[in-house]
Structure formats: C-alpha cells, structure tokens
C-alpha cells in the first residue's frame, strides 16, 4: 500500500502538464496577501538638527493581494528535465483589509537623499548634490503617500540631476507589469528528490552579490519542496526579495484544516554574526556599519540594489543586535508576529501555509557637504516599513487534499 502511495505521490508532484502539482504551481490556488506596516517618523526635525533617536510609530496593515498572476513563458526542457518560467508581479490594494487608503501620508526618510549621499562619496560631487537638494527643497525626511512610497514617485531632487538617472523612486518601483526571473527549476521527471529545486536564476547558478557559498542559489523558491520531507531536514530556499538563499528548520507539528503539516521556521542562527555563526562570514560585506562583522540581524543588500544602501532585517529588528535598534525608539519585536514560517505538508512537500516577514531599512550617514545630513553624529539604519506576506490553503482545496492525499495515507 505504502509503495503504491509513494508511486502516486512521485507521479503527482512532477512539474509537468497533467499533474496536481503543475496545476497549482503555474497559478497558485491560494490567495496570497501582502500586508505593509509603515514606520511613521514622529520627530524628523529633532533627528536632523540634533541627531536624536528616531521615534517611529508603525501604521498598518495596508493590504495588497499579490501572486495572483500565472507564471509566464513556462517552457519544459526534456533534455535536462527542467522547466523555466517568469513569475509576474502584480499588487491590488484591498481597502477592506486595510486601516486606511493608498493616499494616507507618512513621514519617512528621504530615499533619494539617503541613497545619493551614500552612492556618491566624492566630496566635490556631494557639494553639487547639496546644492541640488537645497534647490529642490528636499530634506532628510519627506512626507509621502503610501502609493508613492511603495510604487514610485518623481523625486524633485533627482529631477534636477543633469545626468540620465532614473528620477522615479519607490521601495518596490517598478513592480506592476514586471516579472521575477527567469527561473529554471528541476521538474522531477528523472529524480523526484530534485523537484522544484532551482537550477538557474536569470541564467546563472550564482548571484554575483556575495563571496563564496553565500552567493549560491540553493533549494527551491519555498512554494514547495521535494516530497517526503523529514523533520530533521534543513530546508534551503532562495528569495529574490532578500537577494540570497536562506534556510528553515523544523519547529513543531501543526494541524492545518485537518491536514498534518510540519512548521519550519527561519532560525535566529540564520541572522547571526559570523562570530556566532561562522557560515555567515560572507554576508558581512563591510566593516564599519557592521562594527567589524559583530553586528547581526541586518543584511546589506546594496550590491543587489544598484548601490542603494538597502538593509533587510526581520520586522522590528527581531534577532538583531542591540546596536542596530539602539538609535530607533518605538520598536517592539516579538517572535510570534515577526518571524517567518512555512507550513509544509510532508508527503507532497507542498507549502500549504506560510508567513514571510521582512523589514526594509535604509542606511543614512552623516555628510559634511550635505547640509540636511550635516548635523548627524552617527549612522542610522532607518526602518521604512515591514511586510507580512501570507497564504493559506483554501477550505475547498484543503478538503480535496485531505481526501486525495492525507486521507489515503491515514
């Protein structure tokens, strides 16, 4: 009996036309929502003038429906048993699941000023940038609507730059009508233990952002894993949002709508400094902000963001070192709300429920030549927003799953 079930499962999790896996893989049957909480800065003047701690107050959730578009350019390669695809991006605002509208205003760090002052270190250039910042009446902080902050706005300072630079700025700009990939993943036809594992991303087996093993593209995209998942496994997956591969470990057994699933979580060790976790040495890319690689819980992804000083962390700097959150007031990290987990049905390897949480931060540094940054006495890793992307198998799908998979086994 067990062998027959194994055989059926192996057949149904292959990523090819006609299988259960393929149908749900091309277009997820799960509704996926991305909730945003924006960190509204309460004391912009005091920070700019006196280098005070930044007082933030989170406002949210502002909810968008995401991942509702089917994968595009799905192409099977029979020779190497892979399937390639693009994952299109799309976001639809959900007013009923939000505390306000996309027109709500927030006081946030001026993204262009912070980025330009970091990217252009040359003192002479900074003097020129300073005159353009002043001319455009830009400052260290700005007031922006939610829509502008997320999806883009024409920046008045960048509009004065005489070079052909992109003058539109937004944390997720461009997003709608773009796609992530090309991904090329194993379809599992020749070896089911490789199903959904990424072979190449954008035509390469590594990212070119990190040194050594940190640069590798490991595992799947976390939507599914090879079948027959064991609790002892370390599940590797790649996330283009954070420009790296990461891993999850078993935490507990969970009952999800009558389906037994394994809850895998991202452990604090994955965010540790190289002092505590030597494997992480290659995620430490500079010595000053990281205090000689002793700071932890923030990931400098500037290489992946055209040099813009973007730092990724868990929400509210969960699992981060005290020096990171010390200059920021108003943060309350807690594991239940702010960690990432995947609920995986172990027989099929399908992720039936997940919560991906991350925080986007921007580094801002003092600058002698830029007036609006002149009074800063220290570096700040400034939280801009955090997000919670969740998906749960629907009741109908869960019933089907119970009857076709778990019911047959039990």
């Amino acid at each position: 009996g067990d062998l027959l079930i194994q055989k059926t499962i192996k057949k149904q999790v292959v990523l090819e036309e006609g299988t259960i896996a393929f149908k749900n893989w091309v277009k997820t049957g799960t509704e996926v929502y991305r909730q945003f909480w924006i960190f509204d800065v309460q004391n912009p003047q005091e920070v700019m003038m006196n280098s005070s701690n930044i007082q933030v107050k989170q406002r949210g959730p502002y909810t968008y429906r995401v991942r509702f578009l089917a994968k595009e350019n799905v192409t099977q390669d029979a020779e190497d048993n892979t399937v390639s695809f693009l994952q299109p991006n799309g976001a639809i605002f959900e007013p009923s699941l939000s505390v306000g509208t996309e027109a709500d205003n927030f006081t946030v760090l001026n993204l262009a000023v912070a980025a330009a002052s970091h990217i252009y270190q040359n003192q002479f250039v900074q003097m020129i940038l300073n005159s353009l910042i002043n001319k455009s009446k830009s400052s260290m902080f700005q007031v922006r609507t939610l829509r502008e902050l997320l999806w883009g706005y024409r920046d008045p300072f960048l509009s004065l730059v005489p070079y052909p630079v992109t003058t539109t700025v937004g944390l997720f700009y461009p997003y709608n009508n773009t796609a992530d990939g090309v991904y090329k993943v194993f379809n599992g036809k020749d070896n089911i233990s490789k199903v959904a594992i990424i072979d190449t991303y954008k035509g390469k087996r590594n990212l070119s952002y990190w040194e050594s093993h940190c640069d590798m593209i490991n595992g799947t995209d976390a939507a599914s894993f090879p079948p027959f998942v064991e609790k002892s496994q370390v599940l590797q997956f790649f996330s283009s949002d954070i420009c790296r591969s990461i891993y999850a470990v078993f935490e507990s057994d969970v009952n999800l709508k009558g389906i037994p699933v394994y809850r895998f979580v991202l452990p604090s060790k994955a965010f540790a400094s190289p002092v505590e976790n030597p494997d992480n040495y290659c995620f430490c890319t500079e010595k000053i902000i990281s205090k000689n690689c002793t700071s932890y819980g923030v990931l400098d992804i500037s290489k992946c963001k055209e040099g813009r000083p973007v730092y990724i962390s868990l929400p509210h700097f969960l699992y981060a070192s005290p020096d990171v959150s010390e200059p920021i007031d108003g943060l309350n990290p807690n594991e239940e709300e702010h960690r990432t987990y995947l609920d995986i049905e172990p027989i099929t390897g399908f992720t039936l429920q997940f919560a991906k949480r991350l925080q986007v931060n921007l580094l801002v540094k003092p600058s002698e030549k830029i007036q609006v940054l002149k009074n800063l006495k220290r570096n700040y890793i400034v939280p801009i927003l955090w997000l919670n992307e969740t998906g749960t198998i629907g009741d109908e799908k869960a019933n089907m799953f119970r009857s076709q998979v778990t019911g047959k086994i039990n």
């Epitope: 990217i119 252009y120 270190q121 040359n122 250039v125 001319k135 730059v161 005489p162 070079y163 055209e306």
Partner: antibody, heavy 119, light 112 residues
C-alpha cells in the same frame, strides 16, 4: 596625476565585435563617471554614454544603445566598451574621458583607440 | 537632439590677435536645476581634446586667463584675447543640459 590609458588600435572585420579598454590611475576610480566619445575621421565628436564604476550604473546616447555596452572592472580600475555588429560606419577614434564630478564635463581624456572596420 | 552650431568653421588669425568663436544651440541650455552646462574643448592636431571652459565661463585649472567664455540661453562665445602658437587647433563647444549630450561641429583656429 590622473591618467587614462586606452588599448591599442584595432582592425576588425564587418559583423564582428570589439572590446576597447581604458585603464585609469592617479585617482579613486569608483568616485567618477567614465564617458566614451566617438570621433569619426575628420569629423566632430559624439558622446556615446557613461558608466559609474561604483555601482555599474550607465547612461547612453540612444543612438549607441544597441551598438555599445559599457562595463568596468573595479579591481583593475579599468573601463571597457564593447562595440558589436561592426560596420565601416563604426571606424573612428574612440576616447574614454573622466567626468569632472557631476557638472557634465570631461576633465581628463584617454589618448584614443583607433578602430578600423574593413574586410 | 540639441544641435550645436559653431561659427566660423575656420578662423585664420595672426599671433597676438584676438579671436572669437560663436556657438549657438537649437534650444536653451538652461537646465531645470538652473545651471547652464555649456563647455569648451580644444583639440590640438594628433591629440585628445582638452577642457578649457566649463559652465559657460569657468576656466579649468591650468587654462591661461587669455581664454574667456560668455553667453546665456542659446548664444555663447569663446574669446582668446591674444592668440599664441600653442592655441592652434580645433575648438568644440559641448552641451550637457539635454540628453543626449552633443558637441558643436568644431572651429579650426589657424595662422593667417
């Protein structure tokens, strides 16, 4: 003192590609944009585009967008320009030139690389 | 594209004379940031161009004070108060206010 040393003359066949180099010294390479300029024989100058070595950001003259690709190797302080699908129209002297620092002028120039496209 | 028209095409002078080169642009070179990115270069025979004047009237370091630039909007002038033998070559105006940045056709300064 600032110097830009370009690679030697090139004789290539139509349809081929060529990669010209420009090695910088005497300043912090990643701090300044590097531009490329074309001068056809006995003619004026044309701006091709620029690259910012710090982050690899580029800006092109649309006319050259499908002709030229600009790259850098920061470890050797070298800028490169690859020209593809060459025709006799691409025969010219190509200069690299350093940006004066965000005021859109070129303060130091390479000696030029002569490219001849001929069968 | 902004067309830069230089006149004259050729300028024969005697050493010690004053020389004046005109450059006219097809549209105003005042950038939205208020600056005018009009520069002048000199290319001596067999050499690379060299920067003389940037942003209409600022002499680049090491450029003798006999060179001066003036103008605004669409009309610009380069003046050499007393021409010396080392000043001979082709002078180009250049605009960096509108992408794509463009050069003038050049004015050849030669001995009468």
């Amino acid at each position: 003192d600032v110097q830009l040393q370009e690679s030697g003359p090139e004789l290539v066949k139509p349809g081929a590609s060529v990669k010209i180099s420009c090695k910088a010294s005497g300043y912090t390479f990643t701090d300044y944009n590097m531009h490329w300029v074309k001068q056809s024989h006995g003619k004026s100058l044309e701006w091709i585009g620029y690259i910012y070595p710090y982050n690899g950001g580029t800006g092109y003259n649309q006319k050259f967008k499908s002709k030229a690709t600009l790259t850098v190797d920061n470890s050797s302080s070298t800028a490169y320009m690859e020209l593809r699908s060459l025709t006799s129209e691409d025969s010219a002297v190509y200069y690299c030139a350093r940006d004066g620092g965000y005021d859109v002028y070129f303060d130091y120039w390479g000696q030029g690389t002569t490219l001849t496209v001929s069968s | 594209d902004v067309v830069m028209t230089q006149t004259p095409l050729s300028l024969p002078v005697s050493l010690g004379d004053q020389a004046s080169i005109s450059c006219r642009s097809s549209q105003s070179l005042v950038h939205s940031n208020g600056n005018t990115y009009l520069h002048w270069y000199l290319q001596k025979p067999g050499q690379s161009p060299k920067l003389l004047i940037y942003k209409v009237s600022n002499r680049f370091s090491g450029v003798p004070d006999r060179f001066s630039g003036s103008g605004s909007g669409t009309d610009f002038t380069l003046k050499i108060s007393r021409v010396e033998a080392e000043d001979l070559g082709v002078y180009y105006c250049f605009q960096g206010s509108h992408v794509p940045w463009t050069f003038g056709g050049g004015t050849k300064l030669e001995i009468k």
